[in-house]
């Protein structure tokens, strides 16, 4: 949950690619005004997930979740929250 | 803002070699089945995507990272 808060559109696109859902990918890419060549590139990546099957998608989703919830990322998120609190306090 | 570790993972997935990408994944999930899958996906992406495709994927990632939705 926390990871999606850091950059929701990234995780939208990533999970659309990994799920192999072309419609979902198109919807996500429309949100960032993706060009046709950019869409083509992402669909080539999506093809690899589709070709390698469900287990492959699950395993790569697990990797992304693990990285996103690792101390490397969570430490960063906590640090950002602390900075935000400081700024808010100073702003008053 | 996207976490630098996630950004590095995606960058290596697109622009690195299979060795580099798998090494990066291993720092977070060192299960043989996960690493083998990472190598398979990376090999597939390298075989499918041209230099132009990868440039386009990188430009899309830039749009994502700088989007108000990120």
């Amino acid at each position: 949950v926390k990871m999606a808060e850091t950059c929701p559109i990234f995780y939208d696109v990533f999970f659309a690619v990994a799920n192999g859902n072309e419609l979902l990918l198109d919807l996500s890419l429309t949100k960032v005004n993706a060009t046709e060549p950019e869409r083509t590139a992402m669909k080539k990546i999506q093809d690899c997930y589709v070709e390698n099957g469900l287990i492959s998608r699950v395993l790569d989703g697990l990797v992304m979740t693990t990285i996103s919830s690792s101390k490397d990322c969570m430490g960063e998120a906590v640090q950002n929250t602390v900075e935000d609190l400081k700024l808010n306090t100073l702003g008053r | 803002e996207i976490c630098p570790a996630v950004k590095r993972d995606v960058d290596l997935f697109l622009t690195g070699t299979p060795d580099e990408y798998v090494e990066q994944v291993a720092q977070y999930k060192a299960l043989p089945v996960v690493l083998e899958n990472a190598r398979i996906l990376k090999n597939c992406v390298d075989a499918k995507m041209t230099e132009e495709d990868k440039e386009n994927a990188l430009s899309l990632l830039d749009k994502i990272y700088t989007s108000p939705l990120c």
């Epitope: - | 690195g16 299979p18 190598r39 398979i40 090999n43 041209t50 440039e55």
Partner: antibody
Framework: QVQLVESGGGLVKPGGSLRLSCAAS????????MNWIRQAPGKGLEWISY????????YYADSVKGRFTISRDNAKNSLYLQMNSLRAEDTAVYYC?????????????WGQGTLVTVSS | EIVLTQSPDFQSVTPKEKVTITCRAS??????LHWYQQKPDQSPKLLIK???QSFSGVPSRFSGSGSGTDFTLTINSLEAEDAATYYC????????FGQGTKVDIK
Amino acid sequence: QVQLVESGGGLVKPGGSLRLSCAASGFTFSDYYMNWIRQAPGKGLEWISYISSGGSTTYYADSVKGRFTISRDNAKNSLYLQMNSLRAEDTAVYYCARDGKYNTSPGDYWGQGTLVTVSS
Amino acid sequence: EIVLTQSPDFQSVTPKEKVTITCRASQSIGSSLHWYQQKPDQSPKLLIKYASQSFSGVPSRFSGSGSGTDFTLTINSLEAEDAATYYCLQSSSLRTFGQGTKVDIK
């Protein structure tokens, strides 16, 4: 056009050291991964090492690990191979080769090679 | 370490004949297999990348196929200038070359 020119080869005694250089031109050197590959006289090709575009990542074949070091100087458009503890079996023509951008074509351009002879 | 085994080691062929060289990997490498041509006293040249993609400037008589562990380089109508040694290279896990296949003209 892409040009890779190796230099620094020569005759060296077993246990000795040598540093090979590869001067690159005709492309943006700092964007490309680079390799060293060797070929013993009358034998096949053997990949030795590669280095990432920024120089932060290096990989080696088991046969040279711990003895050879690959490095690069992007400001000078140069690739290097420091070879220590040389053995007779390291005698070969050493080639530097470029990878296509973003790992799109390993070994797409090669230099003409430089001969290293290890003998007492 | 991934081992690549090429066959045959040597092939003597007449011009216009079709040449087939195979490369077998000791484990699956997807499509991360590349073919090189080396003429005597020259450095190698890339012919085919990622199993089946022709490199720029390579004559159309050269083609590649395969995936996983079994790969093939085909020279459709051999020309005299094709006399050379052909090597496969895998880039899936570090890099390793096959032992080479020497093709000469009868």
